[in-house]
């Protein structure tokens, strides 16, 4: 069976949108009006992994691009990157673990925990126009809560 996917956008809990910054980086900033068209549309795929009532394993690809968010060690630190893949082979049900995020739903907000690096989350800074990154703390200065907006195909 083919992997199930849906198109969506994500905003952090401060309502910052995610946009491309160069070919392999996302940044978070407040957008208004026509600028909203700049925001990244994700293809969220529902992949194999440990699932529970509030936790669902997903992969986050960029719609119509051969890029997926992935988590790797760089200089011994878990790091978020955009990784180029072969479109003939992706998305797939059994994604490599570096591509998998546990989508956790709490009080109508979403967290995206790295399956590869438990307790590390997709994060944004309080500051405007800063890169989206993988953070190892929840409830601190950095933002780990998101909302999801569905986008028609």
């Amino acid at each position: 069976a083919p992997v199930r996917s849906l198109n969506c956008t994500l905003r952090d809990s401060q309502q910052k949108s995610l946009v491309m910054s160069g070919p392999y980086e996302l940044k978070a900033l407040h957008l208004q009006g026509q600028d909203m068209e700049q925001q990244v549309v994700f293809s969220m795929s529902f992949v194999q992994g440990e699932e529970s009532n509030d936790k669902i394993p997903v992969a986050l690809g960029l719609k119509e691009k051969n890029l997926y968010l992935s988590c790797v060690l760089k200089d011994d630190k878990p790091t978020l990157q955009l990784e180029s893949v072969d479109p003939k082979n992706y998305p797939k049900k059994k994604m490599e673990k570096r591509f998998v995020f546990n989508k956790i739903e709490i009080n109508n907000k979403l967290e995206f925990e790295s399956a590869q690096f438990p307790n590390w989350y997709i994060s944004t800074s309080q500051a405007e126009n800063m890169p989206v990154f993988l953070g190892g703390t929840k409830g601190g200065q950095d933002i780990t809560d998101f909302t999801m907006q569905f986008v028609s195909s």
Partner: nanobody, 123 residues
């Protein structure tokens, strides 16, 4: 043509049990995650349970966990829901859904569903 035919519903007293079945045809049953959703009178659809392709993973809504058991028999192209310790609030039409994927706690995607079978829990 995909067909899903549920059966096994009926009237049961609180604390009683029922076993629902869903006979599937028109697709390669064993390849797909399957599940059950329900609709209580005057309410919206509610996800109940899912079972992965190959049946090695099962998932349940909190409201039925420990009381309901989902299973499948790929040789018979049939999905089951064993419902024990039934309560009045379990009264609903139960639908079998093909390629069921949960998106959020109260949102899911599926390709096909059956016509449903009514379960009434009342004394």
């Amino acid at each position: 043509e995909v067909q899903l035919l549920e059966s096994g519903g009926g009237l049961v007293q609180p604390g009683g049990s029922l076993r629902l079945s869903c006979a599937a045809s028109g697709f390669t049953f064993e390849d797909y995650q399957m599940g059950w959703v329900r609709q209580a009178p005057g309410k919206g659809l509610e996800w109940v349970s899912s079972i992965s392709a190959m049946g090695n993973r099962t998932y349940y809504a909190d409201s039925v966990k420990g009381r309901f058991t989902i299973s499948r028999d790929d040789s018979k192209n049939t999905l089951y829901l064993q419902m024990n310790s039934l309560r009045a609030e379990d009264t609903a039409v139960y639908y079998c859904a093909e390629n069921l994927v949960r998106v959020l706690l109260n949102k899911w995607m599926f390709d096909y569903w059956g016509q449903g079978t009514l379960v009434t829990v009342s004394s």
